[in-house]
Amino acid sequence: QGGTRSPRCDCAGDFHKKIGLFCCRGCPAGHYLKAPCTEPCGNSTCLVCPQDTFLAWENHHNSECARCQACDEQASQVALENCSAVADTRCGCKPGWFVECQVSQCVSSSPFYCQPCLDCGALHRHTRLLCSRRDTDCGTCLPGFYEHGDGCVSCPTSTLGSCPERCAAVCGWRQMF
């Protein structure tokens, strides 16, 4: 009778774990374990997580709640959803900004910073894909503008300006020499 014995829980249903002397039922989400049960298969004493802390799991045996994360203002993050007893703060970017991951293999918990979205209008281009998870995808030049190098150039308003071939195709006329 001297060897190692792993604690067994002979309780109906799941969610029982040996805590202290007895197998106890876990606490609900948003609560922490204040005191273990004092009888087999009993209910633990569970208290609501204090402000600015949370526990998202059901039927757990944690004796303290996790601290809510603070959104990183330096990275231009904002709280999309405030922390509650059952869920952590959800940080993201404000409208007009997008998430730029700080690691190559990006997952939901990866560190990130917020970047301002490209304004396609300011670049005189159509918006092909709105900025959300990544930067705005701008399309072709707006009416009255033509492709020139990397940018969109306004169609000439007089015959004095030069109008190369691409200009003529878009702007509808060719300068006469």
Epitope: G2, G20, L21
Partner: antibody, heavy 119, light 113 residues
């Protein structure tokens, strides 16, 4: 062979303090809950404290809560009972007992150590 | 707290006789989750410490002679010695190991005639 050996019993004046020890051998001490049980001069058995294995939780009856403290040193395979504000009714033979891991009955007992509280 | 009441407080029996002692708890010791009764019986011989005989009301501890039989459920329990021997001269205590505070009966003293 499982062995529990208590020590530290003494004559103490009311209001005094004392610490009892229980040296354990023959089993993996840190895997088991342990208790102190006392036997009064009229032969009644009274459970006075328990301590769990692993993350330690402690348990006391109201009669000793706030006066007695159970603790364990797993490295030394030793159980302790620190008693303060002692009263004449604490006079008893004090046994340490090992909890069965499954049912919390006491599957092994030590030979006991005597505490006498008297002025 | 669960109160444990033992009866009789003492009894004197002849060798070979059948002995029955009782233990009553103030609340049920039957756990609905696992259908186990959390009651133990201990034997304490003169000048010795208590020794576990039976746990979960009817499970005999290893090494305990099979003349010791535990029975009962809920609040009423019995320890029977089917044929008493001279070495059975002792005090017998029941204990609920259901919940803290763990509590004991006041004991039954078995004397041999």
């Amino acid at each position: 062979e499982v062995q529990l050996v208590e020590s530290g019993g003494d004559f103490v004046k009311p209001g005094g303090s004392l610490k009892l020890s229980c040296a354990a051998s023959g089993f993996t001490f840190n895997n088991y809950g342990m208790s102190w049980v006392r036997q009064t001069p009229d032969k009644r058995l009274e459970w006075v404290a328990a301590i769990s294995s692993g993350v330690t939780y402690t348990y006391y009856p109201d009669t000793v809560k706030g006066r007695f403290t159970i603790s364990r040193d797993n490295a030394k395979n030793t159980l302790y009972l620190h008693m303060s504000s002692l009263k004449s009714e604490d006079t008893a033979m004090y046994y340490c007992g090992r909890h069965d891991d499954y049912g919390n009955h006491f599957d092994y007992w030590g030979q006991g150590t005597t505490l006498t509280v008297s002025s | 707290d669960i109160v444990m009441t033992q009866s009789p407080s003492s009894l004197a029996m002849s060798l070979g006789q059948r002995v029955t002692m009782n233990c009553k708890s103030s609340q049920s010791l039957l756990n609905s989750h696992n259908q186990k009764n959390y009651l133990a019986w201990y034997q304490q011989k003169p000048g010795q410490s208590p020794k576990l005989l039976v746990y979960f009301a009817s499970s005999r501890e290893s090494g305990v002679p099979d003349r010791f039989i535990g029975s009962g459920s809920g609040t009423d329990f019995t320890l029977t010695i089917s044929s008493v021997q001279a070495e059975d001269l002792a005090d017998y205590f029941c204990q609920q190991h259901y919940s803290t505070p763990f509590t004991f009966g006041s004991g039954t003293k078995l004397e041999i005639k």
